[in-house]
Interface confidence: low
């Protein structure tokens, strides 16, 4: 169900409030915010059209409102006149509307708190960090926010000292924040400036882009390597195990088939002392954009169950392709009696059983295209009585 949430519910005068939206439906045309408990065109604050990403102010817009693509509404520099209900109308693609109403209350302001930290440059999975919200005042509620959201339930987060101190045990790279503390009393609320952590981490396993594996002869090969790391990683390249250069990007003009091979990116973080590598295969070839229809053949199409074996062969003239097999719309092999060989071109079933009867086909594919064979029918017979000398029982 569509709901809205005021962050915070009690707002200090002159500050801002964010009307968050939860359970937003999929496939929307847009949203509209209204002042009050119902949809009233004369009290529209702002409308937002998803298709154009355009926000349009309404009659009740004061110039202090901002609508976000996720339907959240930010109201800045609030006054006590802003206290009350706000209604969100969501216009769905099927033109059925949904509505949700929220509210907040504006109070006079407390002093702005600040955050002190015992360590602003921790190491991932090693250090702990304690944040303390200042000043310490009587009859005050202390709240913490991470990434503009209230604290998640986590064994790595601990509150102490009347919630004035927030401790992060064993920080990760996702703990950079920002962190904010908020103090509240019955008549006001205020939030600190954000504090961020510079968490040292990485490098992660690098990724090589673009994702293309196949290149045409004569093309330029331009590869870029990236590994998440703080501080940023240092990179080097190897081709078929031989060092090439210490750069994040590798460029080879006018490539030939001889440039096919294994391209390794090595990423190193001098602070953590860790390094990671990724290997990408590059194939330089004249590859067909659309693979031809493969041909399927069987060593025999009528077999005796529990006695015979059968070989199915998928033939194609295309190069640089992969082959997969299907039986009754299911991918093979599906049992230990089925074996693939010769680069998946041959499917062997030994011995054939009754449940193997039916339609088989193969599919050939490369990174650009795929095509499938016509189906072939395998018939499985069982003899009622054993036969000798090829003679039928009399």
């Amino acid at each position: 169900q569509l709901t809205t949430e005021s962050m915070p519910f009690n707002v200090a005068e002159g500050k801002e409030v964010l009307l968050l939206v939860h359970n937003l439906p999929q496939q929307l045309f847009g949203y509209s915010w209204y002042k009050g408990e119902r949809v009233d065109g004369n009290r529209q604050i702002v409308g937002y059209a998803i298709g154009t990403q355009q926000a349009t102010p309404g009659p009740a817009n004061s110039g202090r409102e901002t609508i976000y693509p996720n339907a959240s509404l930010l109201i800045q520099n609030v006054t006590q006149n802003d206290t009350g209900f706000y209604t969100l109308q969501v216009i769905k693609s099927d033109l059925v509307n949904e509505e949700a109403t929220g509210q907040f209350h504006v109070y006079p302001e407390l002093p702005k708190p600040s955050i002190s930290s015992n360590n602003s440059n921790p190491v991932e999975d090693k250090d702990a960090v304690a944040f303390t919200c200042e000043p310490e005042t009587q009859d005050t509620t202390y709240l913490w926010w991470i990434n503009n959201q209230s604290l998640p339930v986590s064994p790595r987060l601990q509150l102490s000292n009347g919630n004035r101190t927030l401790t992060l045990l064993s920080v990760t790279r996702n703990d950079t924040g920002p962190y904010e503390c908020e103090i509240q009393n019955p008549v006001s609320a205020n939030r600190s400036d954000p504090v961020t952590l510079n968490v040292t981490y990485g490098p992660d396993t690098p990724t090589i882009s673009p994702s293309d594996t196949y290149y045409r002869p004569g093309a330029n090969l331009s590869l870029s390597c990236y590994a998440a790391s703080n501080p940023p990683a240092q990179y080097s390249w190897l081709i078929n195990g031989t060092f090439q250069q210490s750069t994040q990007e590798l460029f080879i003009p006018n490539i030939t088939v001889n440039n096919s091979g294994s391209y390794t990116c090595h990423a190193n973080n001098s602070v953590t002392g860790c390094n990671r590598t990724t290997v990408k295969t590059i194939i330089v070839t004249e590859l067909s954009p659309v693979v031809a229809k493969p041909q399927i053949k069987a060593s025999k199409t009528t077999v005796t169950g529990d006695k015979d074996s059968v070989n199915l062969t998928c033939s194609t003239n295309d190069t640089g392709i992969s082959i997969r097999w299907f039986f009754k719309n299911q991918s093979l092999p599906s049992s230990e009696r089925m074996k693939l060989s010769q680069g998946n071109t041959t499917l062997s079933i030994n011995p054939v059983k009754r449940e193997d009867a039916g339609t088989y086909w193969c599919e050939v594919f490369n990174p650009i295209s795929k095509n499938q064979s016509d189906p072939i029918m395998l018939n499985v017979n069982y003899n009622a009585l054993p036969q000798e000398n090829g003679l039928s029982p009399g």
Epitope: P210, D212, I368
Partner: antibody
């Protein structure tokens, strides 16, 4: 929302050149193969050119091969069609089309509104 | 190249009637694709991989077929269904379109 906006069409004399552009937004441009498809006035659809997501592969029908060049700039989310040695029979509405992101991208999943090219003396 | 022949060229029916549009290839293809085009508009993908409806296409549309014969069926025509429908293949180079079937109000 996916948007493809073609530009660069117009009137050109036979033998002349024209460069069409297609500005893409609302999707990860570098993950999709892209094509140009044209439609002569009152006629059916005709495929003109295709380029793979990374720009490695380009494909053309015999009718335009050697005269038209498809290219892309993934950093600018833009597709191009350079048309040289234009003929009267190249007169058509030229549509930019997006393929699905998977490797079996043999259909045109989204079309722009087109830009009109008229070749006439 | 593979030639796709659509029939009929024009189909005149009334809302509520069933429509059957045919697309025949001169050589077997693995999949067929269908597009809808209305006057002054760009084509829109309608059916892909023979039988899958594109986003936003109503359930009254269905696609079927294999080999050389493919069909687009509309179970009960609505006013907004009247348009030109094109079939397309790319099982072999070059990709080709049918000449189109114009579905018009009777």
């Amino acid at each position: 929302e996916v948007q493809l906006l073609e530009s660069g069409g117009g009137l050109v004399q036979p033998g002349g050149s024209l460069r069409l552009s297609c500005a893409a937004s609302g999707f990860i441009f570098s993950s999709h193969g892209m094509s140009w498809v044209r439609q002569a006035p009152g006629k059916g659809l005709e495929w003109v050119a295709t380029i793979s997501s990374g720009g490695t592969y380009t494909y053309y029908p015999d009718s335009v091969k050697g005269r038209f060049t498809i290219s892309r700039d993934n950093s600018k989310n833009t597709l191009y069609l350079q048309m040289n040695s234009l003929k009267a029979e190249d007169t058509a509405m030229y549509y930019c089309a997006k393929h699905p992101p998977d490797y079996f991208a043999a259909w045109f999943a989204y079309w722009g509104q087109g830009t009109l090219v008229t070749v006439s003396s | 190249e593979i030639v796709l022949t659509q029939s009929p060229a024009t189909l005149s029916l009334s809302p509520g009637e069933r429509a059957t549009l045919s697309c025949r290839a001169n050589s077997a293809v693995s999949y067929m694709y269908w597009y809808q085009q209305k006057p002054g508009q760009a084509p829109r993908p309608w059916i892909y991989l023979t039988s899958n409806r594109a986003t936003g296409v109503p359930a009254r549309f269905s696609g079927s077929g294999s080999g050389t014969d493919y069909t687009l069926t509309i179970s009960s025509l609505e006013p907004e269904d009247f348009a030109v429908y094109y079939c397309q293949q790319w099982s072999s180079n070059p990709p080709t379109f049918g000449q189109g079937t114009k579905l018009e109000i009777k």
